[in-house]
């Protein structure tokens, strides 16, 4: 990963288009924190484990967050 | 359609200053990173500075490091280069170069939209 | 600091011929760094491949990119008139920063 110690935040850019929650593979949220200020959307497609930074303040990416959220709770016990 | 013009190059002496512009039109500017590219008469493609779409993070070129500062203008949809103690070794097209949507560290989906660029001529 | 070599230096085709472009890295490169661009003369570059294999919006599908580790390629599968130009190879490389291959022009014979 070409990380280095002066990398401060994940994502160079944020899209704002929508994610079928069929397509994805993973849903990474990492909250704010000292390195990084802001919250930041890691979505891993299915399709080639390709990973897409989010706009958190996107309605879509913000429906994506409820349907999955709604998912997982109706797996759970 | 998306759309980025540059602006600002010309003719300049060794030592003097030139500050570039690049303008976005046809997408959301702010959510994008963004990038210097120069190409030297002749030559091929030379990366020279990168911008997170929020400010967080900006990186440059060895050759530039100290000289040269990127930033960007969110609510102006402007994109800079400011340019210090230029040499002859600097004269080039320099290109804008938006950064496709959802790159991050682990994932690059490359420079997607391109400006046409501005001359940079530095000489006596 | 990762060096790029593309081979060859200058391609000489027909149109309809196919068309293999290499770009070599000094060390390995995760395929989701890799990326190919087109450059025709007086033009600004444009995007082909991400991901070393992924076609970029509006790319015909005569264009595909192959490759992983140190070793990456450029197809076109049957050249056309508006082909003919630059091809380089960029990658992303830790610090962060984004290099670019020296190029690979591809004209008429």
């Known amino acids: 990963v070409p990380l280095s110690r002066t990398v401060r935040c994940t994502c160079i850019s944020i899209s704002n288009q929508p994610v079928n929650p069929r397509s994805l593979e993973k849903l990474e949220i990492i909250p704010a924190s000292q390195f990084c200020p802001r919250v930041e959307i890691i979505a891993t497609m299915k399709k080639k484990g390709e990973k897409r930074c989010l706009n958190p303040e996107s309605k879509a990416i913000k429906n994506l967050l409820k349907a999955v959220s709604k998912e997982r709770s109706k797996r759970s016990p | 359609q998306m759309q980025l013009v540059e602006s600002g190059g010309g003719v300049v002496q060794p030592g003097r200053s030139l500050r570039l512009s690049c303008t976005a039109s046809?997408?959301?500017?702010?959510?994008?990173?963004m990038h210097w590219v120069r190409q030297a008469p002749g030559k091929g493609l030379e990366w020279v500075a990168v911008?997170?779409?929020?400010?967080?993070?900006?990186f440059y070129v060895d050759s530039v490091k100290g000289r040269f500062t990127i930033s960007r203008d969110n609510s102006k949809n402007t994109l800079y280069l400011e340019m210090n103690s230029l040499r002859a070794e600097d004269t080039a097209i320099y290109y804008c170069?938006?950064?496709?949507?959802?790159?991050?560290?682990?994932?690059?989906?490359?420079?997607?939209?391109w400006g046409q660029g501005t001359t940079v001529t530095v000489g006596s | 600091e990762i060096v790029l070599t593309q081979s060859p230096g200058t391609l000489s085709l027909s149109p309809g011929e196919r068309a293999t472009l290499s770009c070599r890295a000094s060390?390995?490169?995760?395929?989701?760094?890799l990326a190919w661009y087109q450059q025709k003369p007086g033009q600004a570059p444009r995007l082909l491949i991400y991901?070393?294999?992924s076609r970029a919006t509006g790319i015909p599908d005569r264009f595909s990119g192959s490759g992983s580790g140190t070793d990456f390629t450029l197809t076109i599968s049957r050249l056309e008139p508006e082909d003919f130009a630059v091809y380089y190879c960029?990658?992303?490389?830790?610090?962060?920063?984004?290099?670019f291959g020296p190029g690979t022009k591809v004209d008429i014979k």
């Open positions: 170069a938006r950064e496709g949507d959802g790159s991050g560290i682990y994932y690059y989906y490359g420079m997607d939209v």
């Open positions: 991901g070393a294999s």
């Open positions: 911008i997170w779409f929020d400010g967080m993070n900006k």
């Open positions: 046809g997408f959301t500017f702010s959510n994008n990173g």
């Open positions: 060390q390995s490169v995760s395929s989701s760094y």
């Open positions: 960029q990658q992303y490389g830790s610090s962060p920063i984004f290099t």
